[in-house]
């Protein structure tokens, strides 16, 4: 990519912060190994990646977590990547799922989701999951990310 | 992004290669169906990918392993992308667990991580497994590679 | 990227599409939140992505399943990207498995495969499972995509 | 309907080596594992390995670990299991056999008789 | 290793019989055993695995039970193309080990 003014590289890569809020909506941080390329994407309230340009993102999250199939509900873990455009309501662009392991007292189960979309100036993109309580925050295991093409 | 002089194309995937070594880093060749745009990005000693220039890269990893449950420790399989600057202390950029299988003698599972990273003149990259005698080596099953945004 | 005449962006991301079909090649459609950026690049009779300029790609793709080790053959659920070029013989690219789960009446579980890989003009790129019966088409679980660096 | 068709019967001498293949056919050979069983003259069974042949990973009994190798080529979806430094007592028919998820056996090749003899 | 024992190591029975054959693991396999039947020159057929899941085409005559290190494989009514030797194998563990063998003979 050039490098220039008109053509700036915009990416970035956080990492998951454990959150004591009951929402799905993953929590994420500019902290350890992170990369924020410039003021063109940003981390807004810990939870979205929002752009300011419009174009094509290859955007991906990594999600790890622990569950057992006895102390979990009988649905599968799912982990989604989802896109509020400005003034739109919300949809999801990726989904993964994985059924829970009967290891004790959780078995560990990564999901690495990714994909190249097209987003406009405001959008954010964020990581919903069935089971925020179930994800493992150790160093490397959950983060998120884009880079603009 | 331009080919030109200033700014090449830096890309190179690469193919796992079995390794009667007992170290927990994976080994890989320049063989098969693989990618090395150039001298800019290196394989040294079939352990690591190396790079010339600073910037923004999108790294990533693809380990398929067989284990079994009964077999293994009772720790999960992890596969970790490694980070070891110039003249400086390796570190985890990123993790992937999976619990071992029921299957007999052994189950296959696929890991895949990758993440956006700033490297430096100089940096290498890594990929570090818990049981490298455990990692599938047969045709695409494990890989290792990266691009320069 | 530039976006000019000599370097357009080239990318696509298709979603997966139930058929009737007993191939075991995923079918795609440009439907949902698809990308196709241009003529450089296009969805084959459902199921190849064909590019039109020389140059690497980063490849992916991410099928989710659901499958039931009595109910499958006992043999791991296996997802395979693979090179159709120009007058030759198809060849595996990457490759991941996953045991099967013994939820019931099937456990989803998903797998993502990407990387860099040098295309001709011409070449065609497509993914093999071997029961695509067990495929999830359910919105964002299962897609294809593509990115010229 | 699968089928395993192994190579013919061989004689060797002590010391030597002998490599039998087992050619698949009729399934989806490759995504499945391979089991070695011998079986000495007017014994039982035994087992000397496993390999999972698209995947590459192996296992071995003990008892014969640095003397057998298995290995498998995916394209021809052949097995073939290589034993060296032969005695009298490896005598015995090799078989091949599919093995599926919790290890059983569920097809055989019809053996291959290894004589070894001075 | 895990050590698989066989009992009797022969038996002599009438069409007809219900037979059944036990076998002993040395220590706990879970449901990790497997039930063969082998006629003199010919390979092994697998006739039970999991300790007792029938295998496709096996007839329904032949059962098997337990789990730990007891199991059992039943014939309910012998007929004459039954009479061979049979083997447990456990896949626990590797190396993966048979029990001894059991011969069935007609009385």
């Known amino acids: 990519m050039q490098k220039g003014d008109q053509n700036p590289q915009i990416a970035a890569h956080v990492i998951s912060e454990a959150s004591s809020k009951t929402t799905s909506v993953l929590q994420w941080a500019e902290k350890g190994y992170y990369t924020m390329s410039n003021n063109l994407v940003t981390l807004e309230n810990g939870k979205q990646l929002t752009v300011k340009r419009q174009g094509l993102y290859y955007i991906y999250a990594q999600v790890t977590f622990c569950s057992n199939r006895e102390a979990s509900s009988q649905a599968p873990f799912i982990a989604s990547l989802c896109l509020k455009p400005p003034n739109r309501f919300e949809r999801i662009l990726l989904r993964a799922a994985n059924t829970h392991s009967s290891a004790k007292p959780c078995g560990q189960q990564s999901i690495h989701l990714g994909g190249i979309f097209e987003l406009q100036p405001g959008a954010s993109v964020f990581v919903n999951v069935t089971d925020p309580s179930q994800v493992s925050h150790g160093t490397g295991f959950t983060s998120f990310g884009l880079l603009k093409l | 992004m331009q080919k030109g002089d200033q700014n090449p194309q830096i890309a190179a995937h690469v193919i796992s290669e079995a390794s009667s070594k007992t170290t927990s880093v994976l080994q890989w060749a320049e063989k098969g169906y693989y990618t090395m745009s150039n001298n800019l990005v290196t394989l040294e000693n079939g352990k690591q990918l190396t790079v010339k220039r600073q910037g923004l890269y999108y790294i990533y990893a693809q380990v398929t392993f067989c284990s079994n449950r009964e077999a293994s420790s009772q720790a999960p399989f992890i596969a970790s992308l490694c980070l070891k600057p110039p003249n400086r202390f390796e570190r985890i950029l990123l993790r992937a667990a999976n619990t071992h299988s029921s299957a007999k003698p052994c189950g296959q599972q696929s890991i895949h991580l990758g993440g956006i990273f700033e490297l430096q003149p100089g940096a290498s990259v890594f990929v570090n497994v818990t049981d490298p005698s455990q990692v599938s080596h047969g045709t695409g099953f494990t890989s290792f590679g990266l691009l320069k945004l | 990227m530039q976006k000019g005449d000599q370097n357009p962006q080239i990318a696509a991301h298709v979603i997966s599409e139930a058929s009737s079909k007993t191939t075991s090649v995923l079918q795609w459609a440009e439907k949902g939140y698809y990308t196709m950026s241009n003529n450089l690049v296009t969805l084959e009779n459902g199921k190849q992505l064909t590019v039109k300029r020389q140059g690497l790609y980063y490849i992916y793709a991410q099928v989710t399943f659901c499958s039931n080790r009595e109910a499958s053959s006992q043999a791991p659920f296996i997802a395979s990207l693979c090179l159709k070029p120009p007058n030759r013989f198809e060849r595996i690219l990457l490759r991941a498995a996953n045991t099967h789960s013994s939820a019931k009446p099937c456990g989803q579980q998903s797998i993502h495969l990407g990387g860099i890989f040098e295309l001709q003009p011409g070449a065609s790129v497509f993914v093999n499972v071997t029961d695509p019966s067990q495929v999830s088409h359910g919105t964002g679980f299962t897609s294809f995509g593509l990115l010229k660096l | 309907q699968v089928q395993l068709v192994q190579s013919g019967a061989e004689v060797k001498k002590p010391g030597s080596s002998v490599k039998v293949s087992c050619k698949a056919s009729?399934?989806?050979?490759?995504?499945?594992?391979i089991s070695w069983v011998r079986q000495a003259p007017g014994q039982g069974l035994e087992w000397m390995g496993w390999?999972?042949?698209?995947?590459?990973?192996?296992n071995y009994a003990q008892k014969f670990q640095g003397r057998v190798t298995i290995t498998a080529d995916e394209s021809t979806s052949t097995a073939y299991m290589e034993l060296s430094s032969l005695r009298s007592e490896d005598t015995a028919v090799y078989y091949c056999?599919?093995?599926?998820?919790?290890?059983?056996?569920?097809?055989w090749g019809q053996g291959t008789l290894v004589t070894v003899s001075s | 290793d895990i050590q698989m024992t066989q009992s009797p190591s022969s038996l002599s029975a009438s069409v007809g019989d219900r037979v059944t054959i036990t076998c002993r693991a040395s220590q706990s396999i879970s449901s990790y055993l497997n039930w063969y039947q082998q006629k003199p020159g010919k390979a092994p057929k697998l006739l039970i695995y999991y300790a007792n899941s029938l295998q496709s085409g096996v007839p329904s005559r032949f059962s098997g039970s337990g789990s730990g290190t007891d199991f059992t494989l039943t014939i309910s009514s012998l007929q004459p193309e039954d009479f061979a030797t049979y083997y447990c194998?456990?896949?626990?563990?590797?190396?993966?080990?048979f029990g001894q063998g059991t011969k069935v003979e007609i009385k």
């Open positions: 390999i999972s042949p698209i995947f590459g990973n192996t």
């Open positions: 056999a599919r093995s599926r998820y919790y290890g059983d056996l569920d097809y």
């Open positions: 009729g399934g989806t050979f490759s995504s499945y594992g």
């Open positions: 194998q456990q896949s626990d563990s590797i190396p993966w080990t």
